[in-house]
């Protein structure tokens, strides 16, 4: 299974496009920067077995995907650019679970690492409570779009030592 | 290895124009912002603009628009600080750091080793 | 603009004296504020962002406080490379603005 080649390029279009997404100057939006607590330590380790790994990569795409398919976020964002953006993470998301499939009958190890799927969960919970609080408004899904880019640059790294494992 | 290179030493002569770069390695430069600092000689910290290089949206400090000008090729990942017309009060050392934009993480974490520009007749 | 005010402008210690350093923002910055450090001839060098948070790599003795207005940079037991020019600046808001600077020297 040759994930994290493909998933690394899908990453990367992803990026690509959320950068596209800004809609006002961030310049404005300083006084909104939050700290969302990423779960930096689940990237971290070198503990995991290939299919628990992509597992983490897994929620943390499908949280995303959920995040901008609220109605919300249509109302935010320029919808050819969003609906770009969920049709590379929905690619993302297939590839990962054909993966993890081809994976399962090489390794002993359980497939998930429930605590690591809990914290990323927990991330996009603070993530939502924040837009919430700040009732949607354009300069929280301005700080909500960087702190994705920055946690797709991240898992990006995490990716990357996946691959030199191999 | 992150890092921010900054172009070397200039003297000039007053009315002079200059342009000095800021290359950004090690990151993804249009991640970040670049701003930039003013250090007169003896003296205190002074910010005076920054830019995003994703887009070139650039943002100065009052006391400094109209004086100079930021940009940035983020084909090259280098930002640039320029005069068109240098005055004796210009001189002084300039230094670009790194900001995060609306990322949370640490403010000017990396910051280039500075370039003295020295304006004289 | 926000103006930040540092205090002391200067101050004389001695190695293993506690040191603190005083910030005021003319309105609230919230926690938007960082620290840094300058050495003669050197870049400055971020020693603590967002009020309190340590920067990676620097020695657990220096430390951040407060919120709002006011802000306190503390080293705890002040070391022979601490000698330098300290300056706070806030970050909420364009432009961002340094204090003038609070040079430590040896006593």
């Known amino acids: 299974c040759d994930l994290p080649q493909t998933h690394s390029l899908g990453n990367r279009r992803a990026l690509i496009l959320l950068a596209q997404m800004g809609r006002i100057s961030p310049f404005s939006c300083l006084k909104d920067r939050h700290d969302f607590g990423f779960p930096q330590e689940e990237f971290d380790g070198n503990q995991f077995q290939k299919a628990q790994a992509i597992s983490v990569l897994h929620e943390m795409i499908q949280q995303t995907f959920n995040l901008f398919s609220t109605k919300d976020s249509s109302a935010t964002w320029e919808q050819s650019l969003l609906e770009k953006f969920s049709t590379e993470l929905n690619q993302q998301l297939n590839d990962m679970e054909a993966c993890v499939i081809q994976e399962v009958g090489v390794e002993e190890t359980p497939l998930m690492n429930v605590d690591s799927i809990l914290a990323v969960k927990k991330y996009f919970q603070r993530i939502t409570l924040y837009l919430t609080e700040k009732k949607y408004s354009p300069c929280a899904w301005e700080v909500v779009r960087a702190e994705i880019m920055r946690s797709f640059s991240l898992s990006k790294i995490f990716q990357e030592r996946l691959r030199r494992k191999e | 290895e992150v890092q921010l290179v900054q172009s070397g030493a200039e003297v000039k002569k007053p009315g002079e124009s200059l342009k000095i770069s800021c290359k950004g390695s090690g990151y993804s430069f249009t991640s970040y912002w670049i701003g930039w600092v003013r250090q007169m000689p003896g003296k205190g910290l002074e910010w005076m603009g920054i830019?995003?290089?994703?887009?070139?949206?650039?943002r100065y400090s009052p006391s400094f628009q109209g004086q100079v000008t930021i940009s940035a090729d983020k084909s090259i990942s280098t930002a640039y600080l320029q005069w068109s017309s240098l005055k004796a009060s210009d001189t002084a050392m300039y230094y670009c750091?790194?900001?995060?934009?609306?990322?949370?993480?640490?403010?000017?974490?990396?910051w280039g080793q500075g370039t003295l520009v020295t304006v004289s007749s | 603009d926000i103006q930040m005010t540092q205090s002391p402008s200067s101050l004389s210690a001695s190695v293993g004296d506690r040191v603190t350093i005083t910030c005021r923002a003319s309105q609230s910055i919230n926690r938007f504020l960082n620290w840094y450090q300058q050495k003669p001839g050197k870049a400055p060098k971020l020693l603590i962002y967002?009020?309190?948070s340590l920067q990676s790599g620097v020695p657990s003795r220096f430390s951040g406080s407060g919120s709002g207005t006011d802000f306190t940079l503390t080293i705890s037991s002040l070391q022979p490379e601490d000698f330098a020019t300290y300056y706070c600046q806030q970050a909420i808001d364009l432009p961002f603005t340094f204090g003038q600077g609070t040079k430590v020297e040896i006593k």
């Open positions: 830019i995003d290089p994703s887009d070139s949206d650039t």
């Open positions: 967002a009020a309190s």
């Open positions: 750091a790194r900001h995060p934009g609306l990322a949370w993480a640490p403010d000017f974490d990396y």
